[in-house]
């Protein structure tokens, strides 16, 4: 049975959440991946997704969310810049594999964003206030609209289990435009 576990990230407004979803299996490398928010009692909502097929080391930006898939490591990097208090919530990464239901990546992220000066980065957080320059070319997001009823949650149980590979998610308002972004160093 699948155990739904969470990993908590506590950050300040203006900071950047920078997490990785471990999709483990090579067969998922080219699969389209999505970042979803889970609100109690509702279907998970897709906020951003990679292209289909998912390209290696090819950043996609949707608003303040940046997704980058690293096939060589089996990891999807998810960044959310300029965090706001309203971004607080529960998130998950999934792999789209139609016609089957999305495959969930382990674990969920419980993001808590608080007001206050971001200060110096600690060993367990990234408080860099990066400003990403966005090129003018944009395309429409092509995220699948379906969500499996089996992924609907009542308030998911809060877990303190420290599990090996965090996954990642975040919140934003306008998810219509996907923007290709150069690699940031």
């Amino acid at each position: 049975a699948t155990k739904l576990t969470e990993e908590k990230y506590e950050l300040k407004e203006g900071q950047t959440l920078d997490v990785k979803c471990d999709y483990t299996l090579e067969k998922f490398a080219s699969s389209q991946k999505a970042w979803q928010i889970i609100r109690d009692g509702e279907m998970p909502k897709t906020l951003a997704c990679t292209e289909r097929p998912s390209k290696n080391s090819h950043p996609v930006q949707v608003g303040r969310i940046i997704l980058e898939d690293y096939h060589d490591h089996g990891l999807l990097r998810v960044r959310m810049v300029n965090l706001q208090v309203e971004d607080s919530g529960l998130y998950q990464c999934v792999i789209y594999q139609p016609p089957k239901e999305p495959h969930m990546l382990f674990d969920r992220i419980r993001l808590v964003v608080t007001k206050g000066f971001s200060g110096t980065p600690g060993s367990n957080e990234n408080s860099t206030q990066n400003v990403y320059k966005i090129p003018p070319t944009t395309t429409k997001a092509l995220c699948p609209l379906y969500t499996s009823p089996r992924t609907v949650t009542q308030a998911p149980p809060k877990s303190t289990a420290d599990v090996s590979t965090p996954d990642s998610e975040i919140n934003l308002t306008n998810v219509t435009d996907i923007i290709r972004v150069p690699v940031f160093n």
């Epitope: 060589d72 990891l75 990097r77 960044r79 090996s164």
Partner: antibody, heavy 117, light 111 residues
Framework: EVQLVESGGALVKPGGSLRLSCAAS????????IHWVRQAPGKGLEWIGR????????KYDPKVKGRFTISADTSKNTAYLQMNSLKTEDTAVYYC??????????WGQGTLVTVSS | EIVLTQSPATLSLSPGERATLSCRAS??????????LNWYQQKPGQAPRLLIY???YRGRGIPARFSGSGSGTDFTLTISSLEPEDFAVYYC?????????FGQGTKVEIK
């Protein structure tokens, strides 16, 4: 070509400190996790911990938590293992590794740490 | 923490023979439809090499004679026909829970 090179191994007295380095080439450590694993002479493998260099988030084996600290400098593409209050039982070859398939891959050649008076 | 127990401790075989190594976990290492159980090979004086990840998937450049199976708590590494370079120590390792843990190893030696 992906390569990890550990350095900093030395002979150190019990109670002493040491910092090991893990220099990566052929990939950006921002894009993966870096793990540290050790192997005492003639013994098995023991996972020490890992870091997500991009976010700085770390995880440790409880046996070393508080004494060992993993960090990374992404501008140098290098991860570090700071070891304090060293004990004789910390004598081992220390490896850094990259990440693949949900676990550790891309291993360095290892660096020997000897803790002895 | 999850304890991994490997058996046998030593396996004495000849080249061309089939090797079957076992790894048992103290609790399930399955989640999200994946078994987070991996196998490594280590030769003297060398770093370990990832052979099998997620119980059944071969690592990069690993020959087809290596295969993995199992789920939950019981796992097997099979080498269909031993080559001279396969004589080494094999470790299972779980990446389901922190701390990641390794088995004590199985030495495959020439008979």
């Amino acid at each position: 070509e992906v390569q990890l090179v550990e350095s900093g191994g030395a002979l150190v007295k019990p109670g002493g400190s040491l910092r090991l380095s893990c220099a990566a080439s052929g990939f950006n450590i921002d894009n993966t996790y870096i793990h540290w694993v050790r192997q005492a002479p003639g013994k098995g493998l023991e996972w020490i911990g890992r870091i997500d260099p991009a976010g700085g988030r770390t995880k440790y084996d409880p046996k070393v938590k508080g004494r060992f600290t993993i960090s990374a400098d992404t501008s140098k593409n290098t991860a570090y293992l700071q070891m304090n209050s060293l004990k004789t039982e910390d004598t081992a070859v220390y490896y850094c590794t990259g990440h693949y398939g949900g676990t550790m891959d891309y291993w360095g050649q290892g660096t020997l740490v000897t803790v002895s008076s | 923490e999850i304890v991994l127990t490997q058996s046998p401790a030593t396996l004495s075989l000849s080249p061309g023979e089939r090797a079957t190594l076992s790894c048992r976990a103290s609790e399930s290492v399955d989640n999200y439809g994946i078994s987070f159980l991996n196998w490594y090979q280590q030769k003297p004086g060398q770093a370990p090499r990832l052979l099998i990840y997620a119980a059944e998937y071969r690592g990069r450049g690993i020959p087809a004679r290596f295969s993995g199976s199992g789920s939950g708590t019981d796992f097997t590494l099979t080498i269909s026909s031993l080559e001279p370079e396969d004589f080494a120590v094999y470790y299972c390792q779980q990446s389901r829970h922190v701390p990641y843990t390794f088995g004590q190893g199985t030495k495959v030696e020439i008979k």
